[in-house]
């Protein structure tokens, strides 16, 4: 049975086996085509989601689709139902929390009262002044809180208490990539993790431990990427894995927050990386223990210099490392989070690519998560 499952796939009507390598190869090998059903699927980037959250205290902003202008949501008459609608528009299904925050002196958007129309937030037509003088601060999910704060050092062993959103993504029980829990159903990782194996069946997620082999595996229902362009294989290196059953959160299994749309991190901003990847370039083996390291944002211009990545780092990517080199993500860390701590931990990057590991002029390159918020929200909405 184990051998059969490992090398063959059972087609129905009529029942017969096909070699497992024929799964997800673009050819219908089973009469009903079920060999092409449970495969990595691509999902287009899609339209702009008409709500977003700002790094200014997680305040809600709403798009006026007629003009293309964004407005800040006034707290006047804002209700739990409106909060739920806003979060649902971003694809969240959990119960949101919201509160009033004072309109700040730097408020540069017009403030409008919000209403609802066919399950979408709208601006109230006859919106007068914002009488409360407050904006809506909205949290769609409790996220980004860990039991333990890491100490700032170079590279050291990590505890799952510090990083309860870190998961191991495994194919045939072998660790391939890292990933981050975003909510009970969804894990964020890199698309390139799935280039070699596009069948969903054999992929599993392991959560809740800092040791590679020691925790139960979770079944995966779907793997979703943006359409792959083989001519630019490093682009759009982002994937969402939908778990078959929702996670139960605990001290060691918790979600990390998505970044705010306007999360612009300046060079030298401190960040953290974690993973079970190689401890040295071409070092041949994964670390059994989760490792953590502090790094910093490296300016994209510097990263694109002639002695570095020569223009390959796009505006949807970011670089992080330490100026002198020596601290970096490596093979096996792919898909894991690049994290920033404000009030909560945010996944600002996904470990994507780089030349070697830890070189001074070639730091790690990460998918910039804020560039893909629309895509994430559109995927989630389609799967609600």
């Amino acid at each position: 049975k184990v051998i059969l499952d490992k090398y063959y796939f059972l087609c129905g009507q009529p029942l017969h086996f096909i070699p497992r390598k024929q799964l997800c190869d673009g050819e219908l090998d089973c009469p009903l085509g079920e060999d092409e059903e449970h495969c990595v699927k691509s999902f287009p980037e899609g339209p702009a989601v008409a709500v977003r959250l700002s790094k200014d205290r997680s305040t809600l902003q709403v798009l006026d689709s007629a003009t293309g202008n964004w407005f800040s949501a006034c707290f006047d008459n804002f209700t739990e139902a409106l909060a739920e609608t806003a979060c649902r528009q971003m694809g969240y299904s959990s119960k949101p929390t919201f509160r009033a925050v004072e309109i700040g002196p730097d408020q540069d958007l017009d403030v409008v009262e919000i209403t609802e129309n066919s399950q979408e937030l709208r601006m109230r037509n006859s919106s007068g002044p914002c009488l409360s003088g407050s904006l809506v601060s909205l949290h769609c999910l409790a996220c980004g809180k860990s039991l333990k704060t890491p100490r700032v050092v170079g590279v050291e062993e990590a505890s799952v208490d510090s990083w309860p959103w870190q998961v191991s993504i495994q194919y045939d029980k072998q660790h391939v990539c890292g990933g981050s829990i975003l909510d009970p159903h969804w894990v964020l990782t890199a698309a390139h993790c799935f280039r070699k194996h596009t069948d969903v069946f054999n992929w599993k997620v392991r959560a809740g431990s800092d040791k590679l082999g020691s925790f139960p595996s979770l079944a995966v229902a779907k793997i979703i990427i943006i359409e792959f362009n083989p001519m630019y294989p490093k682009d759009n290196d982002i994937a969402l894995m939908k778990l078959q059953f929702p996670l139960t959160f605990s001290g060691t299994v918790r979600p990390i927050c998505l970044p705010f749309f306007d999360e612009e991190l300046t060079p030298a901003t401190p960040l953290w990386i974690i993973g079970w990847g190689f401890t040295k370039q071409n070092g041949g083996k994964m670390s059994d223990i989760l490792l953590q390291a502090s790094v910093q944002v490296i300016d994209s211009t510097r990263c694109n210099a002639d002695d570095a990545y020569q223009g390959e780092v796009t505006e949807k990517m970011m670089c992080a490392g330490i100026p002198e080199g020596g601290v970096d993500t490596c093979q096996g860390d792919s898909g894991g989070p690049l994290m920033y701590q404000s009030d909560q931990w945010h996944v600002v990057g996904i470990v994507s690519w780089g030349y070697g590991c830890g070189g001074p002029s070639t730091p790690g390159v990460y998918t910039k998560v804020s560039a893909y918020l629309n895509w994430i929200y559109n995927v989630w909405k389609a799967e609600l």
């Epitope: 362009n229 083989p230 001519m231 630019y232 490093k234 020569q310 390959e312 690519w353």
Partner: antibody
Framework: QVQLVQSGAEVKKPGSSVKVSCKAS????????MHWVRQAPGQGLEWMGG????????NYAQKFQGRVTITADESTSTAYMELSSLRSEDTAVYYC????????WGQGTLVTVSS | DIQMTQSPSSLSASVGDRVTITCQAS??????LNWYQQKPGKAPKLLIY???SLESGVPSRFSGSGSGTDFTLTISSLQPEDFATYYC?????????FGQGTKVEIK
């Protein structure tokens, strides 16, 4: 810096095959898409196919499907393009080209098909 | 396949002129557009990749713009060495396709 060095000119008989090589240096050969493009005398550029060595799978233009084979040898950082069942209208300069930033083209290989 | 329509097919200009060449894709290609320069008997040379990124070593008088379906290559002040044929190429989808070329000649 990036360099693509192609094999020399070839004169071939109709019905035969030609294999053009393209040796890459100055970048990570496996990670970038390599195109094969041809240009008939006085004409524009025509894409034939391409490959990304790390994934090993080649793509081909419909027009050349079944007649062209593109391969890559990671150990020597060399890409190959083989065109079979040659006819006189295949007389052209054949180029390999790296996609993206530092997108560089080989110097070209003239293939003349004549009886 | 995505069609790339380049215009004009040829133009005459003088040294110092500002020259604009346009390229239109038959469907949305985001910013996956390259511009090449080719001189007689030579291989094409990349000028602009991803619609607006200037290739290393290319003079700053060359610039590219556009996104979606409409793209432009601009030479701000034409130099003697710029007389050549220019091609656009989409690399959004397989098969990548080229425009038919724009020949820039001396007036």
């Amino acid at each position: 810096q990036v360099q693509l060095v192609q094999s020399g000119a070839e004169v071939k008989k109709p019905g035969s095959s030609v294999k053009v090589s393209c040796k890459a240096s100055g970048y990570t050969f496996t990670d970038y898409y390599m195109h094969w493009v041809r240009q008939a005398p006085g004409q524009g550029l025509e894409w034939m196919g391409g490959i990304i060595p790390i994934f090993g799978t080649a793509n081909y233009a419909q027009k050349f499907q079944g007649r062209v084979t593109i391969t890559a040898d990671e150990s020597t950082s060399t890409a190959y393009m083989e065109l079979s069942s040659l006819r006189s209208e295949d007389t052209a300069v054949y180029y390999c080209a790296k996609e993206g930033a530092n997108g560089y083209w080989g110097q070209g290989t003239l293939v003349t098909v004549s009886s | 396949d995505i069609q790339m329509t380049q215009s004009p097919s040829s133009l005459s200009a003088s040294v110092g002129d500002r020259v604009t060449i346009t390229c239109q894709a038959s469907q949305d290609i985001s910013n996956y557009l390259n511009w090449y320069q080719q001189k007689p008997g030579k291989a094409p040379k990349l000028l602009i990749y991803k619609a607006s990124s200037l290739e290393s070593g290319v003079p700053s008088r060359f610039s590219g713009s556009g996104s979606g379906t409409d793209f432009t290559l601009t030479i701000s002040s034409l130099q003697p060495e710029d007389f050549a044929t220019y091609y656009c190429q989409q690399s959004s989808r397989i098969p990548p396709t080229f425009g038919q070329g724009t020949k820039v000649e001396i007036k």
